[in-house]
């Protein structure tokens, strides 16, 4: 059996965060948008993902993982530079591929110590280990040594992907399951709200059947759809009320009527 090394230790640097706000708890705020953000977790000493509601909250919130790490992890940039120069890689770069306990289909990247390259793998959506990166670039920056592989032969071409909201969806099949692609939706002239409210309902890539709501920009209403439990896009709300609050305010019916609340 493949036993994973412990990966619960502090990722980089000392235990003391660089700024006081890095010690604040993740605060999703009172609004109900679903914006992927990152915060520094004082318990794990890592930057982690959370869903931001779109308003209020606190300063421990970053748009990118990189920004969070730079801001809150002491010595992060120095360590990242060391890794890139081949001097030293974090231990987790040497962990074996672990798809995790769950069986969603999420495109991720890991460092392969045999080939000395970052490669694509399918992550199940929960647990696993820290040799798991959202982008090829992030994987390369932290784990790959450019001296060994200036231009890897089997480097994944980003043109093989369709980027939709927060998910990167392969055109091909994953584990014999055809992965859906969300059609590109033109931005409507009469809609001035959040861009993900224009995306079509996307049931995702798993096998559950969960009741969710999406905003239909043509009708200006929120409709029910079945969500399979992972993947999909941000036009996905747990209640009709949240859906309307998040998306309906952007609908401009015409100049005389103004904005529909």
């Amino acid at each position: 059996l493949s036993e994973e090394a412990d990966d619960t230790d502090s990722e980089l640097g000392s235990m003391k965060p660089l700024h006081t706000f890095c010690a604040m708890k993740a605060d999703d705020g009172p609004c109900k948008a679903m914006i992927r953000s990152y915060f520094f977790n004082m318990y794990t000493h890592q930057c982690e993902e959370f869903i931001y509601g779109g308003c209020e909250g606190n300063e421990n919130r970053f748009d990118t993982l990189e920004e969070c790490k730079k801001t809150c992890i002491p010595g992060y940039e120095k360590t990242a530079v060391k890794a890139a120069s081949g001097a030293e890689r974090p231990d987790f770069c040497f962990l074996e591929e672990d798809p995790g306990l769950c069986r969603g289909y999420m495109k991720r990247y890991l460092y392969n110590n045999q080939t000395k390259q970052c490669e694509r793998f399918v992550y199940g959506g929960c647990l696993g280990n820290r040799n798991n990166f959202e982008t090829l670039d992030e994987c390369k920056k932290i784990c790959e040594n450019p001296v060994h592989s200036p231009s890897p032969v089997n480097e994944v071409q980003m043109s093989d992907y369709v980027t939709d909201g927060n998910t990167v969806t392969d055109r091909s099949t994953v584990n014999n399951i055809v992965v859906p692609q969300s059609p590109k939706v033109p931005r409507r002239r009469d809609y001035r709200g959040r861009p993900w409210c224009l995306q079509p309902a996307d049931s995702g890539l798993c096998k559950a059947s969960e009741r969710r709501f999406y905003y239909n920009s043509a009708t200006g209403k929120c409709h029910r759809f079945n969500y399979t439990g992972c993947g999909g896009n941000n036009n996905n709300f747990t209640t009709r009320r949240r859906c309307l609050r998040s998306c309906k305010t952007g609908l401009i019916k015409n100049k005389s009527k103004g904005v529909v609340k």
């Epitope: 977790n41 318990y43 747990t238």
Partner: antibody, heavy 123, light 112 residues
Framework: QVQLQQSGPGLVKPSQTLSLTCAIS??????????WSWIRQSPGRGLEWLGI?????????RYAVSVKSRITINPDTSKNQFSLQLNSVTPEDTAVYYC?????????????WGQGTLVTVSS | DIVLTQSPLSLPVTPGEPASISCRSS???????????LNWYLQKPGQSPQLLIY???NRASGVPDRFSGSGSGTDFTLKISRVEAEDVGVYYC?????????FGQGTKVEIK
């Protein structure tokens, strides 16, 4: 309908090895849509997850740090079962031990449990 | 380790009345698209635990619709809209954001 049937001794002497088996019916230990776990329950510690195994492209295991140096969970594909071995037991290991299936596809949770085995560590 | 703190630890209920159990996590359990890495289980007297709610708010098969799960970030709630006599037992929340998988200490629901 998945069923998990536990077997093993209820009394183990201190410093010896606790061994339990969980026989699976209605699913396969090698299924790529499940994972197989041991969890124990004692009055002092509540429900405590001990470890898990799962097969994807190969077998994986993860163990709780509290027992990592003493625990082994192994699959037995020929008998469609999995086992728990906990070495060097002390009275602290006295608990009801459960095997459980983690549903990897739909529920993402422990949706089937064995009947539980009370293991007492005493001389 | 992620610590889950349940409250109350004991909850006397009247049949037909609503009940609510809280589970607070030491760190966020929400992933993208509103997936919450939190489950709820019920352990009836003398039985093994059974899955009630998965991914924060989804009822497992065969679970009556009087049970509902909600919450986000670090604060989660299990609600029973109208308690029935068969609902007595100990309720546990459980997280799977990171290893080790951890459970709350349990809330014992009993009839008044």
């Amino acid at each position: 309908q998945v069923q998990l049937q536990q077997s093993g001794p209820g009394l183990v002497k201190p410093s010896q090895t606790l061994s339990l088996t969980c026989a699976i019916s209605g699913d396969s230990v090698s299924s790529d849509s499940a994972a197989w776990s041991w969890i124990r329950q004692s009055p002092g510690r509540g429900l405590e997850w001990l470890g898990i195994i799962y097969k994807r492209s190969k077998w994986y295991n993860r163990y709780a740090v509290s027992v990592k140096s003493r625990i082994t969970i192994n699959p037995d594909t020929s008998k469609n079962q999995f086992s728990l071995q906990l070495n060097s037991v002390t009275p602290e290991d006295t608990a009801v031990y459960y095997c459980a299936r983690w549903h990897s596809d739909k529920h993402w949770g422990f949706d089937d449990w064995g009947q539980g085995t009370l293991v007492t560590v005493s001389s | 380790d992620i610590v889950l703190t349940q409250s109350p630890l004991s909850l006397p209920v009247t049949p037909g009345e609503p009940a609510s159990i809280s589970c607070r996590s030491s760190q966020s359990l929400v992933f993208r698209f509103g997936i919450t890495y939190l489950n709820w289980y019920l352990q009836k007297p003398g039985q093994s635990p059974q899955l009630l709610i998965y991914k924060g708010s989804n009822r497992a098969s065969g679970v009556p619709d009087r049970f509902s799960g909600s919450g986000s970030g670090t604060d989660f709630t299990l609600k029973i809209s109208r308690v029935e006599a068969e609902d007595v037992g100990v309720y546990y929340c459980q997280q799977y954001t990171s290893y080790p998988l951890t459970f709350g200490q349990g809330t014992k629901v009993e009839i008044k």
